[in-house]
């Protein structure tokens, strides 16, 4: 794993414990909470990051929790079960034996049930819409410059291949970033759009997951782009299965 050899840290995941106990004394990093080895040359899976987040003591949190983001979905925080590859297991249960099915980004896609609930497969989230509203500026950003800047960011910071950024829409002050990645498109080694979206979400909230890298400083031709609210919508390859009672509520 390409962790920084000199001081043995994980550049892409600060929620790790690293030591030079890999083959040949190489630096090896393990995710907090799960103890799973992570590849520090790429993004860590969202499942392992959520598990690490839940394992961190509440009073010794290393990440900032900004107060100005009123739309943080704290209900979405749970201690997930991850498979040996670090992906979400299709069925998640809490300590009171309440279970539900999730998609590949760990978002619930069925009604809650008991231990008899079956989740046959992990359904892939193939389309993510990141909806942002930026703080007021003197004028609108140039659409092409904004578009290019966000595409550059996903390439450089999150290592997401440019083919997976489908579109960037802008109607001041709303910015929408569309990420698309079908199962057939995702090659070995490609960053998952769900992981990239999660890192971006945490960056926007001032809770960067990167080690020893400055926080996100988004600028368009030198003009700061400050986000004041974020909503993320997930579309699955197979539609979710909720009861009509929930849908009409």
């Amino acid at each position: 794993h390409t962790a920084a050899q000199d001081n043995c840290t994980c550049p892409t995941n600060k929620m790790t414990v690293c030591s030079p106990d890999g083959p040949g004394g190489r630096c090896q990093c393990r995710a907090l909470g799960s103890g799973m080895a992570v590849d520090c040359s790429t993004l860590t899976s969202k499942c392992l990051l959520l598990k690490a987040r839940m394992s961190a003591p509440k009073n010794a949190r290393t990440l900032v929790r900004p107060s100005e983001h009123a739309l943080v979905d704290n209900d979405g925080l749970y201690d997930p079960d991850c498979d040996p590859e670090g992906r979400f297991k299709a069925r998640q249960c809490n300590q009171t034996s309440v279970c539900w099915c999730v998609n590949s980004v760990g978002v619930r896609r069925t009604d809650k049930g008991d231990l008899s609930l079956r989740c046959d497969e992990l359904v892939r989230t193939h389309h993510i819409l990141i909806d942002l509203r930026h703080r007021p500026t003197a004028g609108a950003f140039n659409h092409s410059d904004l578009d290019a800047e966000l595409r550059r960011l996903f390439r450089e910071r999150y290592r997401l291949h440019p083919k997976f950024v489908a579109a960037v829409h802008y109607e001041q002050p709303t910015i929408q970033i569309e990420l698309r990645q079908n199962t057939s498109q995702k090659a070995a080694g490609d960053v998952d759009i769900g992981d990239a979206a999660y890192y971006f979400e945490r960056d926007i909230k001032g809770e960067s997951l990167f080690q020893g890298r400055g926080g996100l400083d988004l600028r368009v031709r030198g003009e700061p782009l400050q986000v004041e609210r974020t909503l993320i919508y997930y579309l699955d390859e197979i539609p979710p299965k909720f009861s009509m009672k929930r849908l009409t509520a």
Epitope: R155, E156, H161, P162, K163, A167, V168
Partner: antibody, heavy 117, light 106 residues
């Protein structure tokens, strides 16, 4: 095999325009980015800008904005860079380079553009 | 714009020598990239993500650094290594290159 093949050398008069082509093969053209870099004789590398081939999104550096136009023809997998209002200091080798999760992973062979009266 | 300053600008060395080229950024960057260019040829990607060798690059090349200070090291110079080396960043637009370091035979 990934290849970027550029058009041949050009000699232009000051004030004229030049259009350099970059024909790609060996990869899915619209999945990538083509960046343009120039190198004046005996000098270093200077980035001009880039075009996202799938969306047509373009970013030009401030220095070249207004004088450069980047386009792509997806039917022939060819990217183009046109520079107008040429002056003698635009004499350089112009390179196209493919971008992915790296800024430039494969480069064209370069096109020498000479601006002389 | 982020300025990259390479040192030295030129360097004379012999086959078998250990050579280090430094690249200093005017503000912090995430990663540094290094390219090798031989006369009349296009640049070739040598090192990406500060320290990872590009495909086919010999292990005598290595890269290190973080923040604003980065280095390219050639542990034992070979005849084919005499070329010009450039560092480059893309942590922010516009992408910028160092002015280059010309490595010549002593």
């Amino acid at each position: 095999e990934v290849q970027l093949v550029q058009s041949g050398p050009e000699v232009k008069k000051p004030g004229a325009s030049v259009k350099v082509s970059c024909k790609a093969s060996g990869f899915t053209f619209t999945d990538y980015v083509i960046g343009w870099v120039r190198q004046a004789p005996g000098q270093g590398l200077e980035w001009i800008g880039e075009i996202y081939l799938g969306s047509g999104t373009i970013y030009y550096t401030e220095k070249f904005k207004g004088r450069v136009t980047m386009t792509a023809d997806t039917s022939t997998s060819t990217a183009y860079m046109e520079l107008s209002s040429l002056r003698s200091e635009d004499t350089a080798v112009y390179y196209c380079a493919r971008g992915s999760i790296f800024p430039f992973d494969y480069w064209g062979q370069g096109t020498l553009v000479t601006v002389s009266s | 714009d982020i300025q990259l300053t390479q040192s030295p600008s030129s360097l004379s060395a012999s086959v078998g020598d250990r050579v280090t080229i430094t690249c200093r950024a005017s503000s912090s960057v995430s990663y540094m990239y290094w390219y090798q260019q031989k006369p009349g040829k296009a640049p070739k990607l040598l090192i990406y993500d500060t320290s990872t060798l590009a495909s086919g690059v010999p292990s005598r090349f290595s890269g290190s650094g973080s923040g604003t200070d980065f280095t390219l090291t050639i542990s034992s110079l070979q005849p084919e290594d005499f070329a010009t080396y450039y560092c480059q960043q893309w942590s922010s637009y516009p992408y910028t290159f160092g002015q280059g370091t010309k490595l010549e035979i002593k």
